[in-house]
């Protein structure tokens, strides 16, 4: 004959555990029913009566089968730099994530505790590493032959236009200006579109290598002529 199904509450066999969605109540020394997600234990079980469950109140939740006396409080409302990606219900906590243009500077178990605006690269610098949900933008100096004239968290260094006749040479923060005749092409040949590791606010020099010093990057330079020096400060 099949074993008789025990109904909660029941005393477990010595050495055995309670079944799925049951818990062992130390006081009653019985296996008792857990409450379903969205509920909590209003009255704990006894030897003769099972757990009495009740729905979570507004702004509280339980996400798992449980026997907690009170539901958990939902997190505070999302701040102005966040968007609510999961609402507070009886079965789940509110989840706040950072709005576009921001990243999570301090995360929590789910969602984000503190959002920060993505760094904007100033002119002469371009985005070398885009921001993600959890990391900031990294800006790098524009390479010779490239420029950025914006303050932006997305703009990379762009190649100078190539002129038949140059009216004003380009620099790291300004495109070349051609004379009235149109440029031969809009991009320097071989210029890399991604942000470059070399900048040109003035004539840039590679340091004399020492043990463990930053490597020379001459092989990374785009082809084409380097722009002349932009006047650096100094007396």
């Amino acid at each position: 004959l099949p074993a008789q199904v025990a109904f909660t509450p029941y005393a477990p066999e010595p050495g055995s555990t309670c079944r799925l969605r049951e818990y062992y109540d130390q006081t009653a020394q019985m296996c008792c029913s857990k409450c379903s997600p969205g509920q909590h234990a209003k009255v704990f079980c006894t030897k003769t009566s099972d757990t009495v469950c009740d729905s979570c109140e507004d702004s509280t939740y339980t996400q798992l089968w449980n026997w907690v006396p009170e539901c958990l409080s939902c997190g505070s409302r999302c701040s102005s730099d966040q968007v609510e990606t999961q609402a507070c219900t009886r079965e789940q906590n509110r989840i706040c994530t950072c709005r576009p243009g921001w990243y999570c500077a301090l995360s929590k178990q789910e969602g984000c505790r503190l959002c920060a605006p993505l760094r904007k690269c100033r002119p002469g610098f371009g985005v070398a590493r885009p921001g993600t949900e959890t990391s900031d933008v990294v800006c790098k100096p524009c390479a010779p032959g490239t420029f950025s004239n914006t303050t932006s968290s997305t703009d990379i260094c762009r190649p100078h236009q190539i002129c038949n006749v140059v009216a004003i040479p380009g620099n790291a923060s300004m495109d070349a200006v051609c004379t009235s005749t149109s440029p031969t092409r809009s991009m320097a040949p071989g210029a890399v579109h991604l942000p470059q590791p070399v900048s040109t606010r003035s004539q840039h020099t590679q340091p004399t290598p020492e043990p463990s010093t930053a490597p020379s990057t001459s092989f990374l330079l785009p082809m084409g002529p380097s722009p002349p020096a932009e006047g650096s400060t100094g007396d």
Partner: antibody, heavy 119, light 106 residues
């Protein structure tokens, strides 16, 4: 927290060279450029140049181009500024400062290194 | 090269006074102007960047403004700890500090 710690004071003779170090901690060293700024006794601040530690690329003020070399060692998160052919008017406190290339500029500075040039 | 002319070079004031320091750029520098405070024997400290933005942790009595190529640092009500030297700094086209303004107790 973010810290830039510079090497100790130096006394040099005219014509010699000096190398000042700036050790960074509390942030990703290669994500920021390092500026060097100096201040002669009782004078204002003078920008000397910057280095991008990631690749070692530099931008020097015209005044210092022939005499300054800025380097970085990413393995120890340290930037270096070497000034050669020292003169008495190079006597100054030399500072390093970090810059993330956003509108937020030089938000953390080293404590300064006094370099005295005297015969 | 862009020159930054800072005025006055020195200034005497009392606690509670409203103080303004001005920096004029020889060329357009957009909003790429910062203000630093320096106390004797200490490194400069960033107060304001991008003309108007207050650096984290800096008291709100400090503010920055602009009119054309004239940039102003205002301290609305001087506190004892504000007596120091102040420098403007342009970082739009190369890099250049103003000459400094020494703020002394009257």
């Amino acid at each position: 927290q973010v810290q830039l710690v510079q090497s100790g004071a130096e006394v040099k003779k005219p014509g010699a060279s000096v190398k000042v170090s700036c050790k960074a901690s509390g942030y990703t060293f290669t994500d920021y450029i390092i500026h060097w700024v100096r201040q002669a006794p009782g004078q204002g601040l003078e920008w000397m140049g910057w280095i991008d530690p990631d690749y070692g690329n530099t931008d020097y003020a015209d005044k210092f181009k022939k005499r300054v070399t800025m380097t970085a060692d990413t393995s120890i998160s340290t930037a270096f500024m070497e000034l050669s052919r020292l003169r008495s008017d190079d006597t100054a406190v030399y500072y390093c400062a970090r810059d993330d290339a956003s509108p937020l500029v030089m938000d953390a500075w080293g404590q300064g290194t006094l370099v005295t040039v005297s015969s | 090269d862009i020159q930054m002319t800072q005025s006055p070079s020195s200034l005497s004031a009392s606690v509670g006074d409203r103080v303004t320091i001005t920096c004029n750029g020889s060329q357009n520098i957009d909003n790429y102007l910062a203000w630093f405070q320096q106390k004797p024997g200490k490194a400069p400290k960033l107060l304001i960047y991008s003309t108007y933005s207050l650096q984290t942790g800096v008291p709100s009595r400090f503010s920055g403004s602009r009119s054309g190529t004239d940039f102003t640092l205002t301290i609305s009500s001087l506190q004892p700890e504000d007596f120091a030297t102040y420098f403007c700094f342009q970082y739009n086209n190369g890099y250049m500090f103003g000459g400094g303004t020494k703020l002394e107790l009257k």
